[in-house]
Every structure is written in C-alpha cells, then in structure tokens.
C-alpha cells in the first residue's frame, strides 16, 4: 500500500521553530511575522513499525526535498542527521529502522523516539539557534516536547 | 464528550444536490479525519471520503468523485458532504465518523446518520 | 481495490455460545483492521481497531485477532444485546473497504 503523509511543522515546547541550517543540519529559534517562512515543512510519513498502544510509528521528510530524518551511531553515539535518499523509493511503507521514529503523542504534545536506539528523542538546546539533535535524557534541560501545526498539501 | 449531530432527513428530486452536514463538539476538530460512509437500504457499508480539518486534505473512492464533495468549517466545527445530480440509486443513510490523524485509533465516534431520499 | 471477504453471512447462535467472524483481506492491510457492531436503524459502534485493541467501554468478551491476512473477530460468551450485524473494515489503503456483515441471529 502507499504510504500516508501529512505535511506539518513542528515547533519545540518553548514555540522554536525548526529551520535549515546549511544543507545538512536543523537548528531551532524563535521565529515571528513573515519570518515563520523559514521554518522546514516536514512530510510525516506513518510507517511500519512494532506495535504499541501510544507509540506510532512515523518518518520525516523534508517536504518537496529528498531528505530524512535519520539516526546513526557516530563516534558510537546515536546521533540524528538529515540523509539524502532517491525519490524514486521515498516514502515507502517499509521505511528502514534509522528513519524511523516513535511518535508519543499525549495532550497534543509530541515526542519522537528513535526507533533505532530506544529512549533517545529528537532535541532541542534551551538556547537560541543551536542544532536540532537526538538527546538520551527526558526531562532535563533539554527540550524534547514538540507542537505539530498542519500545513496544506 | 465527543458527539458527531448529523442534520435531517432530505427528500430530493432526481437531478438535485444534497448538501449534509455533520457538528461535532467534545475534541480538537482540526486533528480528526471527518470520514463520510453510506448506507443503501438493506445493504452494507461503503466509504465515500474523508477530510482533514486542520489542513484541508481530502481523499475520495473513486467510485463517488463528481458524485460528493467534502468540505469542512473550522469556525464552526462542522462537516459537509454534498452530493449532487441526484438518483434514485444515491437513496441511503449517510454517516459522518472520525478518525484520528494518525490512523491509529480506528472510525470510533459516529454520526446518527441522515437518511436521504431520492424520489420523483 | 481491496477486498475484504466476510464470513458467514449469518450465523444463529445461543446466549453464552462463543463465536466467531472472519475477515479475509485481498492484500496486506499492515493491521488497519477494525470491527463495528450495527443495530436495526442505528449508527455502527466501533468495538476493535487495529485488529485487536479494544475501544474504551466496548466489554472483554469481544477480541480480536489476526493470522497474515486473515482477522477474526470472537465474542466469548454471547449476550442478548450482542445480536446484530457485525462489519470489518480495512483503512489502510484507499478506497477504505468494509466487508459484506455478518448477521447475528438468536437460534
């Protein structure tokens, strides 16, 4: 079957926006008026994945760009990049693992898991214009709430 | 608690459009799919189409595009479904359910259906 | 399109029998398979969604389960308000398909 998606932003829980920052990496800031422009459409792709009540399994892509979000070790730490793929073959169903998130969606507040290294989650620094980046805590000073905002196909 | 208030009953010539509508009240409107599924008299179920509020996505069956348009009001948290060029054939119970964005949890709450009826 | 073959068609049974109803999908459905209970002149209820969990205030006697692209939905111990027709569902691909229901009947 085709895979679904849905385009949508995603602001951290202190309203940052995510936006590109040089081809490769997300940085999230406070954005207002016109300037909300910058701020990246991801593509949510839901996706197969293990089974679980309140995790769903999602992939994201930057909208009308082949590129994912993706988890690899690196320097053996699970670290988040933005990987290129052929948009022949993305999205698809079977995404593979290091695409993968698991979406924890609770009172309109959304996480995402890595699917590849359980218990680390997408991140934001407190500070202003840092990287966005996989973190291994919940619940300290890193941000790892996020807001989704619709967006039109 | 959610609840889906679909409008009444409608009698239409052959020919004329229809437009149903479906309020709902209890849940964030703009984060459901809003499905629409019909009802022949003593026939089984048939998905016509659903609508994403809080985007604007629509996707149709084939099998009724020309034949229903799905629209939606954010201000007032309502649905529409409007089917047009009427015939006998389109004489069922019409029903609005939801689903959430994601998929996940299934076409859970639904209207209590409108019967529409296409007579001469 | 997918299919979705539904069985029996009707099926008569006794309260505290158990039974069960099959959904047999065309294709692989990646488990977007849910089951509605329909009363004469009334709205479907949602019982199951993806495949087998359970929706909130649906009774335990109702399961669901899956075997490739075979669903199967089981009511332990019928009770009196348990006869109606019962429908599956698959919303994984468009255009969603429901299978034909199963008529429930007091033997």
């Known amino acids: 079957a085709p895979v679904r998606s849905l385009n949508c932003t995603l602001r951290d829980s202190q309203q940052k926006s995510l936006v590109m920052s040089g081809p490769y990496e997300l940085k999230a800031l406070h954005l207002q008026g016109q300037d909300m422009e910058q701020q990246v459409v991801f593509s949510m792709s839901f996706v197969q994945g293990e089974e679980s009540n309140d995790k769903i399994p999602v992939a994201l892509g930057l909208k009308e760009k082949n590129l994912y979000l993706s988890c690899v070790l690196k320097d053996d730490k699970p670290t988040l990049q933005l990987e290129s793929v052929d948009p022949k073959n993305y999205p698809k169903k079977k995404m593979e693992k290091r695409f993968v998130f698991n979406k924890i969606e609770i009172n309109n507040k959304l996480e995402f898991e890595s699917a590849q290294f359980p218990n680390w989650y997408i991140s934001t620094s407190q500070a202003e214009n840092m990287p966005v980046f996989l973190g291994g805590t919940k619940g300290g000073q890193d941000i790892t709430d996020f807001t989704m905002q619709f967006v039109s196909s | 608690q959610v609840q889906l208030v679909q409008s009444g009953a409608e009698v239409k010539k052959p020919g004329a459009s229809v437009k149903v509508s479906c309020k709902v009240s209890?849940?964030?409107?703009?984060?459901?799919?809003i499905e629409w599924v019909r009802q022949a008299p003593g026939k089984g179920l048939e998905w016509i189409g659903e609508?994403?509020?809080?985007?604007?996505?629509?996707n149709y069956n084939e099998k009724f595009k020309g034949k229903a348009t799905i629209t939606a009001d954010t201000s007032t948290d309502t649905a529409y479904m409007e089917l047009s060029s009427l015939r006998s054939e389109d004489t069922a119970v019409y029903y609005c359910?939801?689903?959430?964005?994601?998929?996940?949890?299934?076409?859970?709450?639904w209207g209590q259906g409108t019967l529409v009826t296409v007579s001469s | 399109d997918i299919q979705m073959t539904q069985s029996p068609s009707s099926l008569s049974a006794s309260v505290g029998d158990r039974v069960t109803i099959t959904c047999k999908a065309s294709?692989?459905?990646?488990?977007?398979l849910s089951w509605f209970q329909q009363k004469p002149g009334k709205a479907p209820k949602s019982l199951i969604y993806?495949?087998?969990r359970l929706v909130d205030g649906v009774p335990s006697r109702f399961s669901g389960s899956a075997s490739g692209t075979d669903y199967t939905l089981t009511i332990s111990s019928l009770q009196p308000e348990d006869f109606a027709t019962y429908y599956c569902?698959?919303?994984?691909?468009?255009?969603?398909?429901f299978g034909q229901g199963t008529k429930l009947e007091i033997k």
């Open positions: 359910s939801t689903i959430y964005y994601d998929y996940d949890q299934g076409f859970t709450y």
């Open positions: 209890g849940y964030t409107f703009s984060r459901y799919w």
């Open positions: 609508i994403l509020p809080g985007n604007g996505n629509i």
């Open positions: 294709q692989d459905i990646d488990r977007y």
């Open positions: 993806r495949v087998k």
């Open positions: 569902l698959q919303y994984d691909e468009f255009p969603y398909t």
